[in-house]
């Protein structure tokens, strides 16, 4: 059933998530910003070929719109999206030695908000009796396509972040 | 109640190998990254890395790359961590603990294992 | 890495003082920073998460404060059980890295 602004979530939850997305768009901007200067890989819209030969996924947020939110769908939905992310991130390990400490913060992060919707989803009893199972995630063949796979991944997970902040931000509104 | 409970005390030779292991029980097991630390009397508290229990996914600290493994074994909710090629700087108390330190902070540690490396 | 500096390194003082622990990052760190208490044969504890909410159990005595760089852990009032090392650790980025610990002694 859609529920309104006026939901059962605490405000502390939304206001942690908030801080959490926020640190998560630093994370990924640093990413971004050291693929750019190292790789001169600056555009991701020159790669979304690449992305689809690679099989890079998107996580839907089909169920979060503000004007029919399905809580439970939702979170659902924000934790699986970020688990998918937990995954493509574990697969560009190795991209560089110089993007290794910026990568390992990111992939804390993701973990760290996943584990936050998690608690919440157990807490209103929404929690799913089955985790969900990491897919098929994209092999990289070369360096270069792992570099790239980074600038579409790190692009994919600030456009989820986006919607994600957007849809949190409404849910903490009085 | 949430805890984790390490193993036993072990000495070890220098250039050997030691494996700690940490049980989880009290909460959902996959839902949480495990890390592993050590206090050493020079060095203070140290992280060492962490383990995702649900992919498995590691990252560790650039000190100890190379030479620690973590892994975890799911169905018994047990995580593990192997120290190679030790060396007398690595006599410590290894602890593992709840979290990544970041948003999700050490919040439920283990008991701590004694790691003594001496010829 | 980020650098946590703590200080002072010990301190002595008697039950009921008010003492302050501080902390200082070689980088900002926003809020991340946790405080951890530890007594010889335990496993260390956390007292403080996000610079300045109190885990759960820990007396109200305990408060933290600050955000950036520079970050505190305050006893209001020192009790016999608060006399242990207290450990600041940055949770900003990876490698997550420690204060070298504070001692607070019996005077």
């Known amino acids: 059933t859609p529920l309104g602004p006026a939901s059962s979530l605490p405000q502390s939850f939304l206001l942690k998530c908030l801080e959490q997305v926020r640190k998560i768009q630093g994370d990924g901007a640093a990413l971004q910003e050291k693929l750019c200067a190292t790789y001169k890989l600056c555009h991701p819209e020159e790669l979304v070929l690449l992305g689809h030969s690679l099989g890079i996924p998107w996580a839907p947020l089909s169920s979060c719109p503000s004007q029919a939110l399905q809580l439970a769908g939702c979170l659902s939905q924000l934790h699986s999206g970020l688990f998918l992310y937990q995954g493509l991130l574990q697969a560009l390990e190795g991209i560089s030695p110089e993007l290794g400490p910026t990568l390992d913060t990111l992939q804390l992060d993701v973990a760290d908000f996943a584990t936050t919707i998690w608690q919440q989803m157990e807490e209103l009893g929404m929690a799913p009796a089955l985790q969900p199972t990491q897919g098929a995630m994209p092999a990289f063949a070369s360096a270069f396509q792992r570099r790239a796979g980074g600038v579409l991944v790190a692009s994919h997970l600030q456009s989820f972040l986006e919607v994600s902040y957007r849809v949190l931000r409404h849910l903490a509104q009085p | 109640e949430m805890q984790l409970v390490q193993s036993g005390a072990e000495a070890r030779k220098p250039g050997s190998s030691v494996k700690v292991s940490c049980k989880a029980s009290?909460?959902?097991?996959?839902?949480?990254?495990i890390s592993w630390l050590r206090q050493t009397p020079g060095q203070g508290l140290e992280w060492m890395g962490w383990?995702?229990?649900?992919?498995?996914?590691?990252i560790y600290a650039q000190k100890f790359q190379g030479r620690v493994t973590m892994t975890r074994d799911t169905p018994i909710t047990t995580a593990y961590m192997e120290l190679s090629t030790l060396r007398s700087e690595d006599t410590a108390v290894y602890y593992c603990?709840?979290?990544?330190?970041?948003?999700?902070?050490?919040?439920?540690w283990g008991q701590g294992t004694m790691v003594t490396v001496s010829s | 890495d980020i650098q946590m500096t703590q200080s002072p390194f010990s301190l002595s003082a008697s039950v009921g003082d008010r003492v302050t622990i501080t902390c200082r990052a070689s980088?900002?760190?926003?809020?991340?920073l946790n405080w951890y208490q530890h007594k010889p044969g335990k496993a260390p504890k956390l007292f403080i998460y996000?610079?300045?909410s109190l885990q759960s159990g820990v007396p109200s005595r305990f408060s933290g404060s600050g955000s950036g760089t520079d970050f505190a852990l305050t006893i209001s009032s020192l009790q016999p059980e608060d006399f242990a090392t207290y450990y600041c650790?940055?949770?900003?980025?990876?490698?997550?890295?420690f204060g070298q610990g504070t001692k607070v002694e019996i005077k």
């Open positions: 996000y610079a300045s």
């Open positions: 603990s709840r979290g990544s330190g970041g948003a999700v902070p050490f919040d439920v």
């Open positions: 650790q940055q949770g900003y980025s990876s490698p997550r890295t």
């Open positions: 980088q900002t760190i926003s809020n991340r």
């Open positions: 383990i995702n229990p649900n992919s498995g996914g590691t």
């Open positions: 009290g909460y959902t097991f996959t839902n949480y990254g």
